[in-house]
């Protein structure tokens, strides 16, 4: 059964639930709401899905049952409207409760919160946990998806199922290790941070389908795949391009039992004609449906065909470009992405869709112009400083990250991007450049041919998270211009910001860089925010310091904090200590 | 709205030769993926090679890879097939066909519009 050609089901839950089974379907319905309704109470959540789960069953065994006509989103919508708290939690949101689908569905979708106010998560001690996961195995993993759904209300659905799946045996392996801890934690931390990755990836494929339309996830999806499956016909990447924006059409829509249903047929599909797109795939067809759907999804790119003719002779040289671009243009810039990217896995995602788009605006001039093909003789000429751009970026960025290592090369970041937007809240900032730092380990360590394609794709990512979260409380025009006008050249207009000259320093306020003694009991991670935080403050303050006064007064922070918790009395350093510092730096920046 | 012409084929020894061509006439942007496809008797049709006019990418089946060549002449809207090592197994009816590039795919004969009336090719000595 392909993606597309269903048969008409009578009851549209009763044909999710027999395609999914129980488990799944319970899983994702969950899911759903908890990207709805953020705020929620777990135990409210299961019983919905409870409810609505009884209620598929009926469907199952009677398609012409009551109500088992409606719409998955009717449905869904009638039991989140039914809860009695709605008001008073989530405010306007409850007013999407009056509206007739599908406007209620766009209503919750338009509420969801990617920065929501819920207490960060914190692990409890191992054997905490693995009683919870021994006595109620069930509850303990629902509990999973349900606190992961709430904090990533764009986390890929079916994805989570696979992360969910991991969780689960992690904690059947190691509950019964010798060594729990050392057993359990590393795995943990390992899905904790490739989860945080999943989910800004997926907000990135979101934003790119709601604010710049399918048009703009087909080029990016035709370039990707491109690259991944080189020796693959046009037509192969253009079937499998089209699935694709189906299903994430769907999971960035809350269709997230028909985004797991389809995604599921796209993985048997690809398999079943793993001949026909890559070599690459023999190891992932072999694994079971999740990790076969992960396995795809991030599947090494294939070889290169041998012997790729030239593109000019097509693409610029032949007089017939403005014929072939007027008959199909669409198709036309489809084959010219296609042709470039199977040639170019050395490039980003964003650049290949960067000369894409100066090809399409040279035609669109050129082929209206007294000789066209004199006016697009030389189209391939403006790609040089395209290419070269990035190249020359991300060459002096791993020389600066190799020189400073990753806790100073974010620094130097947050200095960077505070003096660009110093608007911006100051844990957006932090925790943007952060991300941005750790581009550096992500990529430096490739070579050359791997490295743009790594770095200039993951900035994508990361720039995205600034713009969707700058989003919910815009502060800054600059910010706003360089994330609405282009989503090929967020990156390229964020690096030509300069320093703000517009900006009035924040007032100075000592209570911002004081501190206590509950900073030497933190992670080594805590406190590198801790102190990233200050000098984020610091350059607010004085957003003309240079960067030695920046060090100096980071570097002595960095002492104070060593001295005061190695000291006996902690607290009584911290006060002493730190207002000596806070005079001296104030002294330095001539605050 | 669109015709196509293969020629070339015949009787040939094992190891030896042959050039098919396609011409063809019409809305040549409705053929910007051509393709070359066979069928034995008694067997479904099969794909061979195909190409993008736009392009020049090239695809073939595995059974003819290394021995097969296809090829394209834009100026004169014409498909070559040189096919040299031939078998026995390579005897068949080869049609030319052609579709947009959107769609055609070398493995499914349905997803290509305009079809030849096809030309013998006999491998035997």
């Known amino acids: 059964r392909g993606v597309f050609r269903r048969d008409a089901h009578k009851s549209e839950v009763a044909h999710r639930f027999k395609d999914l089974g129980e488990e799944n379907f319970k899983a994702l319905v969950l899911i759903a709401f908890a990207q709805y309704l953020q705020q929620c109470p777990f135990e409210d959540h299961v019983k919905l899905v409870n409810e609505v789960t009884e209620f598929a069953k009926t469907c199952v065994a009677d398609e012409s049952a009551e109500n088992c006509d409606k719409s998955l989103h009717t449905l869904f919508g009638d039991k989140l409207c039914t809860v009695a708290t709605l008001r008073e939690t989530y405010g306007e949101m409850a007013d999407c409760c009056a509206k007739q689908e599908p406007e209620r569905n766009e209503c919750f979708l338009q509420h969801k919160d990617d920065n929501p106010n819920l207490p960060r998560l914190v692990r409890p001690e191992v054997d905490v946990m693995c009683t919870a996961f021994h006595d109620n195995e069930e509850t303990f993993l629902k509990k999973y998806l349900y606190e992961i759904a709430r904090r990533h209300p764009y986390f890929y659905a079916p994805e989570l199922l696979f992360f969910a799946k991991r969780y689960k045996a992690a904690f059947t392996e190691c509950c019964q290790a010798a060594d729990k801890a050392a057993c359990l934690l590393p795995k943990l931390d390992e899905l904790r941070d490739e989860g945080k990755a999943s989910s800004a990836k997926q907000r990135l494929k979101c934003a790119s389908l709601q604010k710049f339309g399918e048009r703009a996830f087909k080029a990016w999806a035709v370039a990707r795949l491109s690259q991944r499956f080189p020796k693959a016909e046009f037509a192969e990447v253009s079937k499998l391009v089209t699935d694709l924006t189906k299903v994430h059409t769907e999971c960035c829509h809350g269709d997230l039992l028909e985004c797991a249903d389809d995604r599921a047929d796209l993985a048997k599909y690809i398999c079943e004609n793993q001949d026909s797109i890559s070599s690459k795939l023999k190891e992932c067809c072999e694994k079971p449906l999740l990790e076969k759907s992960h396995c795809i999804a991030e599947v090494e790119n294939d070889e290169m065909p041998a012997d790729l003719p030239s593109l000019a002779a097509d693409f610029v040289e032949s007089k017939d470009v403005c014929k072939n671009y007027a008959e199909a243009k669409d198709v036309f810039l489809g084959m010219f992405l296609y042709e470039y990217a199977r040639r170019h896995p050395d490039y980003s995602v964003v650049l290949l869709l960067r000369l894409a788009k100066t090809y399409e605006t040279t035609l669109e001039k050129c082929c209206a112009a007294a000789d066209p093909h004199e006016c697009y003789a030389k189209v391939f000429d403006e790609f040089k400083p395209l290419v070269e751009e990035p190249q020359n970026l991300i060459k002096q960025n791993c020389e600066l990250f190799e020189q400073l290592g990753e806790y100073k090369f974010q620094n130097a970041l947050l200095v960077r991007y505070t003096k660009k937007v110093p608007q911006v809240s100051t844990p957006t900032l932090v925790e943007v450049s952060r991300n941005l730092g750790k581009v550096g380990s992500k990529c430096c360590k490739h070579p050359e041919a791997k490295r743009m394609p790594c770095a200039e794709d993951y900035l994508s990512v990361v720039l995205n998270q600034l713009c969707v979260l700058h989003e919910k409380t815009p502060v800054s025009d600059r910010v706003t211009k360089c994330c609405t006008e282009s989503l090929v050249n967020r990156r390229p207009c964020f690096s030509a910001l300069e320093v703000d000259e517009t900006y009035v320093p924040k007032e100075f306020n000592a209570e911002t860089f004081t501190f206590h003694a509950d900073i030497c009991t933190l992670s080594e991670k805590e406190r590198q925010i801790k102190k990233q935080t200050a000098l984020v403050e610091l350059v607010k303050h004085k957003p003309k310091a240079t960067k030695e006064q920046l060090k100096a007064v980071m570097d002595d922070f960095a002492a104070f904090v060593e001295k005061c918790c190695k000291a006996d009395d902690k607290e009584t350093c911290f006060a002493e200590e730190g207002k000596k510092l806070v005079a001296a730096s104030q002294a330095a920046l001539g605050l | 709205e669109v015709q196509l012409l293969e020629s070339g084929g015949g009787l040939v020894q094992p190891g030896g030769s042959l050039r098919l061509s396609c011409a063809a006439s019409?809305?040549?942007?409705?053929?910007?993926?051509m393709g070359w496809f066979r069928q034995a008797p008694g067997k479904e049709r099969e794909g061979v090679a195909s190409?993008?006019?736009?392009?020049?990418?090239?695809f073939y089946t595995n059974s003819v890879k290394g021995r097969f060549t296809i090829s394209r002449d834009n100026s004169k809207n014409t498909l070559y097939l040189q096919m040299n090592s031939l078998r026995a197994e390579d005897t068949a009816v080869y049609y030319c066909?052609?579709?947009?590039?959107?769609?055609?795919?070398?493995?499914?004969?349905?997803?290509?519009?305009?079809w030849g009336q096809g030309t013998l090719v006999t491998v035997s000595s």
């Open positions: 019409g809305n040549t942007y409705l053929t910007s993926c």
């Open positions: 066909a052609a579709g947009s590039p959107a769609r055609c795919r070398l493995r499914d004969p349905t997803t290509f519009d305009y």
């Open positions: 190409i993008y006019t736009v392009g020049g990418s090239t």
